[in-house]
């Protein structure tokens, strides 16, 4: 019986051009985490295997950094990064647990202020 639960950062927002840490945490189970897969809709971002290290998908290699821990740091954010992200925990003997994070990438406040105010 699967007793574990995934805690995530839930719905988060970040500024365009900035970075964000995607983090999940598996609790309430003694199951061993063998691997965590990070996905965005149909795309694989990264895999962290407990023993074999990280795999970063080539389409994200220039702006995804592994960690902290089993988390993932997404850099140089664009509006197109808005959407659902999933952390998929492969565990033994429980099986698979999935957590969901919704990221909204906003136009930077600097840009907004720049549009509203003129320098005297």
């Amino acid at each position: 019986m699967m007793t574990g639960t995934i805690e995530t950062t839930g719905n988060i927002s970040a500024e365009k051009g900035g970075s964000i840490i995607l983090q999940c945490h598996l609790s309430s189970t003694t199951a061993q985490v063998t691997q965590v897969n990070w996905e965005q809709q149909d795309q694989l971002l990264a895999i962290c295997n407990a023993d074999l290290g990280w795999h970063i998908s080539p389409s994200f290699k220039d702006r995804v950094a592994p960690g902290p821990g089993l988390g993932l740091t997404l850099q140089s954010l664009t509006v197109n990064d808005t959407g659902e992200y999933f952390c998929i925990y492969h565990t033994y003997p429980d099986g698979t647990y999935t957590g969901r994070i919704f990221l909204e990438v906003l136009e930077s406040s600097v840009a907004e202020h720049g549009a509203r105010f003129q320098i005297p």
Epitope: T34, Q35, Q43, L44, N49, D51, H55, S57
Partner: antibody, heavy 119, light 107 residues
Framework: EVQLQQSGPELVKPGASVKISCKTS????????MHWVKQSHGKSLEWIGG????????SYNQKFKGKATLTVDKSSSTAYMELRSLTSEDSAVYYC????????????WGQGTTLTVSS | DIVMTQSHKFMSTSVGDRVSITCKAS??????VAWYQQKPGQSPKLLIY???YRYTGVPDRFTGSGSGTDFTFTISSVQAEDLAVYYC?????????FGGGTKLEIK
């Protein structure tokens, strides 16, 4: 130039053990995971397992747990695979294969070691 | 374990032809798939990964596509030196598994 040089062919008796080596050069040994792959005659490829030379962490295919043991010697930049309680089913070509940087694809392969188990 | 099925064990083609090899995963594997070429008497060689990126030095006649459970490897114009066995492999979850291989024969 990255090279993975495997030990030579082995002819061993059933029930015995064998240790195959994979000596590496041309890169920093501890920075890349090393994997081992089995290819029985005329058949497909099977992943045996992988080892992280930096910390010695291993991941095995359940099918080969108890059959294969993966180790490394950092001082000589060499990976080893020991196979025990050998039977004719273990007769195959065994490859070491190195992954890429933060990539699980097997970018470099050894030349293969042929193991024959026969009485 | 995830089973990778290459439906054709053999494919016969002529020089200059376009050929596609398919690979079906028994479970969802996202884009965690690579393709290898193994010529007679040689070690396998990585051609395509993730599953549409050509490895360094691989000719552009080799392409890959797919996501989820269905993957395709294509040679746009077969050359005599492409005679080999081609394998798909998933690394979405351990144990990482290979397809049974498709042997490309040149007519």
């Amino acid at each position: 130039e990255v090279q993975l040089q495997q030990s030579g062919p082995e002819l061993v008796k059933p029930g015995a053990s064998v240790k195959i080596s994979c000596k590496t050069s041309g890169y920093t040994f501890t920075e890349y995971t090393m994997h081992w792959v089995k290819q029985s005659h005329g058949k497909s490829l099977e992943w045996i397992g992988g080892i992280n030379p930096n910390n010695g962490g291993t991941s095995y295919n359940q099918k080969f747990k108890g059959k294969a043991t993966l180790t490394v010697d950092k001082s000589s930049s060499t990976a080893y695979m020991e196979l025990r309680s050998l039977t004719s089913e273990d007769s195959a070509v065994y490859y070491c294969a190195r992954s890429g940087h933060m990539d699980y694809g097997y970018v470099y392969w050894g030349q293969g070691t042929t193991l024959t188990v026969s009485s | 374990d995830i089973v990778m099925t290459q439906s054709h064990k053999f494919m016969s083609t002529s020089v200059g032809d376009r050929v596609s090899i398919t690979c079906k995963a028994s479970q969802y594997v996202s884009t965690a798939v690579a393709w290898y070429q193994q010529k007679p008497g040689q070690s396998p060689k990585l051609l395509i990964y993730s599953p549409s990126y050509r490895y360094t030095g691989v000719p552009d006649r080799f392409t890959g596509s797919g996501s989820g459970t269905d993957f395709t490897f294509t040679i746009s114009s077969v050359q005599a030196e492409d005679l080999a066995v081609y394998y798909c492999q998933q690394h979405y979850s351990t144990p990482w598994t290979f397809g049974g291989g498709t042997k490309l024969e040149i007519k």
